[in-house]
């Protein structure tokens, strides 16, 4: 059920373009995210018995399409690898090692947080360009599958409690929860 079902309709692999380099590390100066209204970063491996778990994140570069229109620039998408397990057993070529016990729980690497990126779409035949915000995976996490193997049945590691709305870790330059920006002159 999730947005992933839409992915193939809206993306196009760019021939000859490899994976993007990993994004640069974020500034060490962290914000008080509760005060700033962001979602605190989610740490699915904080529980002591799963601290070794690792989740594979791959980057792909694609043009996005919306009907006949195509993005003016390629977009880097993060894709969560299907398997996850103890980091020390996770091979470079993922999938070669079946690390879990036959009767043990099954874990899957799935999207944890999402982010939006503005995309300018150019359309053929002189049609007006479009502006969209694309939903991209911001991070991945390991979840335990129940016997139903449903997305809605995936279980998180560790408890989650009420928290300030949203905030994955703010990207560099991100604003905190604050007054309406509309008071500023339109920058576009």
């Amino acid at each position: 059920q999730g947005w992933q079902a839409f992915r193939n309709d809206a993306t196009e692999v760019i021939p000859g373009l490899g994976e993007y380099p990993e994004p640069p590390p974020e500034n060490n100066q962290t914000m008080n995210r509760a005060e700033n209204g962001g979602r605190p970063p989610h740490h699915p491996y904080d529980a002591k018995d799963v601290s070794e778990y690792s989740c594979r994140e791959l980057h792909y570069t694609r043009f996005l399409t919306d009907g006949p229109c195509r993005s003016a620039k390629p977009v880097t998408e993060l894709v969560c690898s299907g398997q996850c397990g103890p980091a020390r057993l996770l091979p470079n070529a993922i999938g070669r090692v079946k690390w879990w016990r036959p009767n043990g729980p099954d874990f899957r690497c799935i999207p944890d947080r999402y982010r939006a990126q503005r995309v300018q779409l150019l359309c053929p035949g002189g049609a007006a360009p479009r502006s969209r915000k694309v939903r991209l995976v911001a991070s991945c996490k390991c979840k335990r599958l129940t016997r139903f193997h449903n997305q809605s049945e995936l279980k998180d590691f560790g408890p989650e409690t009420a928290r300030p709305q949203k905030g994955r870790k703010p990207r560099p330059g991100a604003r905190g929860a604050k007054a309406n920006q509309a008071e500023l002159e339109n920058a576009y």
Partner: antibody, heavy 121, light 109 residues
Framework: EVQLVQSGAEVKKPGASVKVSCKVS????????IHWVRQAPGKGLEWMGG????????IYAQKFQGRVTMTEDTSTDTAYMELSSLRSEDTAVYYC??????????????WGQGTLVTVSS | QAVVTQEPSLTVSPGGTVTLTCGSS?????????PYWFQQKPGQAPRTLIS???DKHSWTPARFSGSLLGGKAALTLSGAQPEDEAEYYC?????????FGGGTKLTVL
């Protein structure tokens, strides 16, 4: 299909606080961008605040800054909007709204049924 | 704070065409304001008709269309039906903050 179910009507005294809940089903809360909108009787829609996925932050309308807090409980897929220091002009129907969880962000696609908050002494 | 302006009221004959507009006090409305249009009938929650200037939804009747006209966002209704009588609101995105217009009361008469 995303569905939003809000808590029931509330009657509050001036100066009190109110906390309205919005239960999400069909998707998990972390997949969605929740916004809160209110409508005073006979008036127009007014955006109060919500999650901006571009920056990963909650943004509040200037008018409500310092009085409103938007939180979530991901274990129950429930979003909350708390408004403090209530006054009579806060009497309104409060709506939560969310995107459709599609590949392209389309905000305000699904709406809760609304929660009437009456502020009266 | 930005002010988003709409016509307070408009009247259209059944089968006729009408255009509702949405302007911004900060200047011309562009595709980067991702204009939204909502329909609201008395006692009901709003319903999204148009997102991102011109993007219709599965439930949006074909007679509604969105565009940009003369520095404003526009909602055009072609072939008005009695059930289209409602309040219509536009919404503009100012970098993650949103501002609603005051609404247009559309009468089909």
């Amino acid at each position: 299909e995303v569905q939003l179910v809000q808590s029931g009507a509330e009657v509050k005294k001036p100066g009190a606080s109110v906390k309205v809940s919005c239960k999400v089903s069909g998707y998990t809360l972390s997949e969605l961008s929740i916004h809160w909108v209110r409508q005073a009787p006979g008036k127009g829609l007014e955006w109060m605040g919500g999650f901006d996925p571009e920056d990963g932050e909650t943004i509040y309308a200037q008018k409500f800054q310092g009085r409103v807090t938007m939180t979530e409980d991901t274990s129950t897929d429930t979003a909350y909007m708390e408004l403090s220091s209530l006054r009579s002009e806060d009497t309104a129907v409060y709506y939560c709204a969310t995107d459709s969880a599609g590949y392209w962000y389309k905000f305000f696609q699904h709406w809760g049924q609304g929660t009437l908050v009456t502020v009266s002494s | 704070q930005a002010v988003v302006t709409q016509e307070p009221s408009l009247t259209v004959s059944p089968g006729g065409t009408v255009t509702l507009t949405c302007g911004s006090s900060t200047g011309a409305v562009t595709i980067d304001h991702y204009p939204y249009w909502f329909q609201q009938k008395p006692g009901q929650a709003p319903r999204t008709l148009i997102s991102d200037t011109d993007d219709k939804h599965s439930w949006t009747p074909a007679r509604f269309s969105g565009s940009l006209l003369g520095g404003k966002a526009a909602l055009t209704l072609s072939g008005a039906q009695p059930e289209d009588e409602a309040e219509y609101y536009c919404l503009l995105d100012y970098g993650g903050s949103f501002v609603f217009g005051g609404g247009t009361k559309l009468t089909v008469l």
